[in-house]
Interface confidence: low
């Protein structure tokens, strides 16, 4: 009678994560008599997945029926696939002997690769905030995939990017790989509303890429313009000066009012109002009786936003063209919370 | 069967340091992250580190950040937990963990995600 012969005749499968893996063994004779055992990798350190003949092992059921007496269909199936299950897998089959049984003939393997999703590809922007005109980098990093073929790509506002570099980890043979990818953006005043995404796509997906997204609102700042000017009289004795602060993101911002350099009165944004690219504007006004001043006031509108040095603008209020009120040497009372008087 | 072996541990002053070592051994061993947890006298065990094995952004616990640093050496194949500026809340047991292949969206600090387990390292701080 012609010798058993070990006949895994899957030279590889492939499965997705999470699901069943079938591995193929027949033997093709009765004789002799012995278990069969399945093993990952081959020599010493390989790893026993099933014992027909002993052993608790949960993830493995047989495809067949091992107890039936002329049984020779061995294959195996392995429940909820992940990526350390990849590898070799050998249908070995043993001779009965005493004390022990001994290896006799193994099947050529059948070599199982595991599909693994990429995780949601998770991305983060600077540390600290910038000003358009300037470049800041993002990462984007995704985990767990296999195989090891991916694409990644950049997009900023639905255009692609093409700054950028890219790693997959570890170079040589593993379970499963890492993405990481280094982009870089140019800010412009016009990103408080942009996005930047990144896109990942894998044999898993089925055409379904994964997306990461930071919004540009979390990394931009945008400073203030200022103006200041000098609105027409509203009482004999009484000049409205107003601080436009225009186009600044984000709200964090806090205005000083200085006459010659004294400070007369700080106040925080509070009721701004938004533009159109996500940008705020704000305006402070103050109110100044001139009726004292025998001299010309510099007044000064000073802006500290968003933790940043202060920025300013000054203008020169001209007493000289405005009548003082006869027999007047005190300034008017305050008529209003923004009202100043100069002494 | 992989075993992980922990080394490091002792008795140390407050706003000292100690270096962690852990060396997976056994079968050829690859793992989607490792990580060290801690257990205090008395206490449920709880999640300090986690690094990826191919590396990435670590994560660690809000109150050990910018004291503990989890590294690896590929070469070696050893994970290490640098720990400064040791506190008396940082007594305890600590233990090296192996996730064998990912099972969370991100770095685990559920216990339950990891496989393997060493058999703990003594850290104590006096003050």
């Known amino acids: 009678e012609e010798e058993l012969q070990v006949i895994q005749p899957d030279k590889s499968v492939l499965v997705a994560a999470g699901e069943t893996a079938t591995l193929r063994c027949t033997a093709t004779s009765l004789i002799p008599v012995g278990p069969i055992q399945w093993f990952r990798g081959a020599g010493p350190g390989r790893e026993l997945i099933y014992n027909q003949k002993e052993g608790h092992f949960p993830r493995v059921t047989t495809v067949s029926d091992l107890t039936k007496r002329n049984n020779m269909d061995f294959s195996i199936r392995i429940g909820n696939i992940t990526p350390a299950d990849a590898g070799t897998y050998y249908c070995v089959k043993f001779r009965k002997g005493s004390p022990d049984d001994v290896e006799f003939k193994s099947g050529a393997g059948t070599e199982l690769s595991v599909r693994a999703k990429p995780s949601a590809p998770v991305v983060s922007g600077p540390a600290a905030r910038a000003t358009p005109q300037h470049t800041v980098s993002f990462t984007c990093e995704s985990h767990g995939f296999s195989p090891r073929d991916i694409t990644l790509k950049w997009f900023k506002n639905g255009n692609e990017l093409s700054d950028f570099q890219t790693n997959v980890d570890p170079v040589g043979e593993s379970v499963s790989y890492s993405i990481h990818s280094t982009a870089k953006v140019v800010l412009t005043r016009e990103d408080v509303h942009s996005q930047v995404i990144c896109e990942v796509a894998h044999v898993t997906l089925q055409g379904d890429p994964l997306r990461g997204t930071a919004n540009l609102s979390e990394t931009i700042r945008v400073p203030p313009t200022l103006e200041v000017t000098q609105q027409p009289v509203r009482a004999e004795n009484q000049v409205n000066v107003t601080c436009q602060v225009r186009k600044f993101y984000p709200q964090r911002l806090q205005l000083t009012w200085l006459e010659n350099g004294n400070v007369s009165r700080t106040e925080t944004a509070s009721t701004v109002t938004e533009n159109k690219d996500g940008t705020y504007n704000w305006m402070s006004w103050l109110l100044v009786n001139v009726s004292a001043h025998r001299d010309d006031v510099k007044l000064t509108c000073q802006v500290e936003h968003d933790g940043q040095p202060a920025v300013s603008k000054s203008h020169d209020l001209k007493v000289s063209a405005h009548p003082k009120e006869q027999g007047s040497n005190t300034a008017a009372e305050n008529t209003g919370s923004n009202e100043r008087n100069i002494y | 069967h992989v075993q992980l072996v922990e080394s490091g541990g002792g008795l140390v002053q407050v706003g000292d340091s100690l270096r962690l070592s852990c060396a997976p051994s056994?079968?050829?061993?690859?793992?989607?992250?490792m990580a060290w947890f801690r257990q205090a006298p008395g206490k449920e065990r709880e999640f300090v580190a986690a690094i990826r094995w191919i590396g990435g952004t670590p994560s660690y616990k809000d109150s050990v950040k910018g004291r503990f640093t989890i590294s690896r050496d590929n070469a070696r194949n050893t994970f290490y937990l640098q720990m400064n500026s040791l506190e008396p809340q940082d007594t305890g047991v600590y233990y090296c963990?192996?996730?064998?292949?990912?099972?969370?969206?991100?770095?685990?600090?559920?216990?339950?995600?990891?496989?393997?387990w060493g058999q703990g390292t003594p850290v104590t701080v006096s003050s």
């Open positions: 056994g079968r050829t061993f690859r793992a989607y992250a």
């Open positions: 963990a192996a996730e064998e292949t990912q099972k969370g969206s991100g770095l685990g600090h559920d216990g339950r995600h990891y496989d393997y």
